[in-house]
Each structure stands twice: as C-alpha cells, then as structure tokens.
Amino acid sequence: KKVVLGKKGDTVELTCTASQKKSIQFHWKNSNQIKILGNQGSFLTKGPSKLNDRADSRRSLWDQGNFPLIIKNLKIEDSDTYICEVEDQKEEVQLLVFGLTANSDTHLLQGQSLTLTLESPPGSSPSVQCRSPRGKNIQGGKTLSVSQLELQDSGTWTCTVLQNQKKVEFKIDIVVLAFQKASSIVYKKEGEQVEFSFPLAFTVEKLTGSGELWWQAERASSSKSWITFDLKNKEVSVKRVTQDPKLQMGKKLPLHLTLPQALPQYAGSGNLTLALEAKTGKLHQEVNLVVMRATQLQKNLTCEVWGPTSPKLMLSLKLENKEAKVSKREKAVWVLNPEAGMWQCLLSDSGQVLLESNIKVLPTWSTPVQP
C-alpha cells in the first residue's frame, strides 16, 4: 500500500494509472466503499462522500491513462485509505494528513515560550524535528516547546514530520517582539543634551500599546517614573512626565527621549517597559547614563563620573599632549596645584576613550608680599 503525507490546508494529488493509455472508466472510493468521484465517458461524476466539494480530477490526463484524485484544503479527518478502481484492478493509497500550529500567536514577546503542536490522524506515530532560524534543532512528538525565546529566534522555523519513512515539511514564520538592544549606555559631559533611543527589532502594520521609563538615579534612595506614554498606530503621546528632569519624547517611532541636560543627579539606570496591545507581558530595554564633571576649586583639579561604570574603566587627568598625571580605576581623580594649560579628563575602556571633558587651568600670579 502506497503512503502519501499531506499538509492541513494544502492540496494533494493521489495518482492512479491504467495500463491502457486511454480514457476508460475509473472510480475513487474511501475505506467505507463510499464513492468519491469517477467518470462517465468524458464527464466527471461525484459520489455522496464528505469530500464532494473539495474533490476533483484532471480530465486532461485521462487520455493518457492517468486518473488522479485531487483533494483541496486538506483536513486531518481526510486521512484514510483511498481506493482507485480501474481495469478490474484496485490501487490503494493511504493518505495521512498532518497539521503544525504555533500556540495562540506567531508574534511572541522576547522571553516567552513557543509551543508547536502537531495535529495527526489517529493511529499514526510521527516524529517531528524543527530547526530554528539560528540553526538550533529541537525534537519531539505531538508538542515541541522552546522556552525563553530570543531575538535570534525570529524568522522561519522549518519543521519536518516523519511517518512511514515519508516526510512532510512545514514552515512557520515566528516574530519575536523585542527591542534591538537589551541594554545601552550613554556617556555624557555635565550639561550636554542626552538622547535615548529605543529601536524595536520588528515591524508591524499597526503598533499600539503603552509604556514607561522607570529610573534609578545613583544618588537617589529609590527609583521613580520619569515618563509614561501611549502608543497608537505608531504615534506616541506622553501621558505623564516627571517635573525633574523634564524629558521630551519624539512623536514617532523609534521611541526617542531627550534629556535637556546631563546632570550628576540624573546619572543611573533606567528600564523602559513597553506593553503591546493584545499581549500579556512587556518588552524591556535597560538604559544607563554616565555623567562626567571636571572642576577646579582653588588649588584642586577634580574629575568625577557618576552612574553605572564597570570596575575596569579608567579615569585619568592629563595635561594636553602629555602623559596622564593621575590614572585610576575609580570614580573620582584629582590633581593638587595643577600647572596652567588645557587639562583633559578621560574615561576609557582598554585604551578606548568613552568620555572626555576639557578644563582650562589659568596661571596663578603670586602677588609680592608688601613690606
């Protein structure tokens, strides 16, 4: 008995060939001996089967002795043994129809789970193997689960169903809803304008939801909301903004926030959360702000940084075009009695300068002591 695998929703063509290369009488029946279709001369006739409106044949092939049964919009329950009666012979074809669907939705939030469920006919024992867009293979039976979806899991998942040494392939497009970056860090000199951007890693026709930037300043004892907003069809409207700092928000995607000036009291870490319509859960992006200040107070030249810096970052004070006078893995460095000239405060990571602030030290004129 020939075995043919089909996919739910697809069209399948079951072949039946006569030895004579001419149009002769044929019938297709199911396992209950109910006639599906056949011919009467050059006319196609249909029986009382459930396939009535979905069954067809190719009249153009009858003259060549081919009498296929075409079943459109396959259903799992179409799985059956189909019998072609031609020239006093019977050809049996076993059709097994499978379906593979993703849980609830193919648009999933980063960190959520993807469950792929195989629909299969009773009595079958298929095995399934799926390959993710990043080349990861998962195997299973009726259900396959992938927990903690990552951005790289976005794309086409290719799943192969194996039954009776035959295989059928499914392709499912999965969109992982996430920000392009999980975390970002902005380095600014005191007083500079700060731009925060939160680009999304996906595109959809209509994007509706709401969000908030929650901020923990390094110098504050508790965290607080800096801004809340709504998103309607990719248009951003601010709901509530804190008095200090007075953030501004762009009206279009990507989500974009402007802090008028970087100040030490704003340095810290924020978490932008975005809730999307019809989705439970939220997208998150961490953002960090590091602020540098260089000051000269009497005979002390000081450079300080505030915010989340890694312990391997180096803070240095140097006179322009000279070797660093002081260089430490600390958040503040200073030079006593600095010589005149343009001093540079540098925050660097393995030699790469992340932030630089210049301060001019003027020469000090010693006034003669009066007799």
């Epitope: 509706t208 939801g209 709401s210 908030e212 004892s221 607080k224 008095q243 939220k282």
Partner: antibody, heavy 119, light 107 residues
Framework: EVQVVESGGGLVQPGGSLRLSCAAS????????MSWVRQAPGKGLEWVAN????????YYVDSVKGRFTISRDNAKNSLYLQMNSLRAEDTAVYYC????????????WGQGTLVTVSS | DIQMTQSPSSVSGSVGDRVTITCRAS??????LAWYQQKPGKAPKLLIF???SLQSGVPSRFSGSGSGTDFTLTISSLQPEDFATYYC?????????FGQGTKVQIK
C-alpha cells in the same frame, strides 16, 4: 521607610466643612503626585482627587467637584483635602495615597481617617 | 468616565485552589490597570501594576494578564492569608476608577 499618615477626620453635620491632612515621610514628597481615595462603610474604593508634584494640576471625581479642594505644601511634606458642603454620602474612610508605583499605580496608602457626616 | 466591572462579586475557595477574578473596562485602557488586595480594617495593598507586572514583595502565586478591556487576576494556589477583597483600578484617564471588588472567602 515610606509613610503616609492621615488626620482631621471626625463627625460633622451635613453642610459643614472639614480639612483632612496627610503627613508624608521617607520619600521626596515634592517628586510625587498624591491622591485621596475614600471608602464608604461596607462599600468599595472610590478615587476622589489627585494633585501634581508641584500642585499645578488637580483632578477630581465629578461628585466632589466644586465642594472639595486638594492642595499640598511641599515644604511641610503635607497633603490636604478641604471638604465643604458635606453630605451624608461623603461619609467614608479617607486614604492619603502616593501615586509612586510603576505604571501610575497607587503604591503607598495611609491607614485612613474616618469622616462621618450626620445630623 | 471609564466603568470597571469585576466578576464574580464573591468567590469561595479552599487552600490550594486556583482562583481567577476578571475585570472589564467599558473602553480600552491599554495596560493601565492595577490590582489591589484589602483585608478588613486595613488599607489596600498594591499587587499588580501595568496589568501583568508583580509588585516587589508580592508572592509569585499572584499573576495578572490582559490588555485593552479584559483583564484577569489569578491566584495559582490559594493560601490562608489570601482571603480578602480584591479591586482592579484603571489609570488610563481621569477620574481613576475602581472595580466594585471581589471577595475571596473560605469555602
């Protein structure tokens, strides 16, 4: 530790006035919106009014508009609710609440002060 | 004003039961929804904010879901200290409004 403590409740005749106060501590009061929420005996919660950090914006539920006034004194870390033309249906426990939670949630509640309007 | 309708108004359960409370908004409120727990003679306590995020210090048996107009609070395994009244509240537009409350009582 964040704390909000209400005071000023009591028995008042219909048509009378009362001023509720709320003393806040343990957080930077001037950085938060504040709300008053009430609960009539055996009933559910009803939001009454709120006020922006520096007091420039105030919102009220329709049933108290024109009768109640919310105000704050950031120098004293205090929130107030001036209630005039009181009615029997204003009888409730009044809670002072900080609107400091994420997604505009009401995160810290006082223990409440009971206002009884009766002749 | 946005009306918030909770159901059921009361539910009886035993320790270990799974309890689900629903809240429906008369118009879309995105995810501007919070859930509170109130015990007799006490002030309400914030459980869930932004429809689905758990407030710090709240046990993980509490969870929230939904967006738009339909929201759910689930207690996965009822504990003796969970017998209380639960309220949903919208923060989408003024005036903020609460649901009428759902009393969770011992069966």
């Amino acid at each position: 530790e964040v704390q909000v403590v209400e005071s000023g409740g009591g028995l008042v005749q219909p048509g009378g006035s009362l001023r509720l106060s709320c003393a806040a501590s343990g957080f930077t009061f001037s950085s938060y919106w504040m709300s008053w929420v009430r609960q009539a005996p055996g009933k559910g919660l009803e939001w009454v009014a709120n006020i922006k950090e520096e007091g420039s914006e105030k919102y009220y539920v329709d049933s108290v508009k024109g009768r109640f006034t919310i105000s704050r004194d950031n120098a004293k870390n205090s929130l107030y609710l001036q209630m005039n033309s009181l009615r029997a249906e204003d009888t409730a426990v009044y809670y002072c609440v900080r609107e400091g939670g994420q997604w505009l949630a009401l995160d810290y509640w006082g223990q409440g002060t009971l206002v009884t309007v009766s002749s | 004003d946005i009306q918030m309708t909770q159901s059921p108004s009361s539910v009886s359960g035993s320790v270990g039961d799974r309890v689900t409370i629903t809240c429906r908004a008369s118009q879309g409120i995105s995810s501007w929804l919070a859930w509170y727990q109130q015990k007799p003679g006490k002030a309400p306590k914030l459980l869930i904010f932004g429809a689905s995020s758990l407030q710090s210090g709240v046990p993980s048996r509490f969870s929230g879901s939904g967006s738009g107009t339909d929201f759910t609070l689930t207690i996965s395994s009822l504990q003796p200290e969970d017998f209380a009244t639960y309220y949903c509240q919208q923060a989408n537009s003024f005036p903020w409004t609460f649901g009428q409350g759902t009393k969770v009582q011992i069966k």
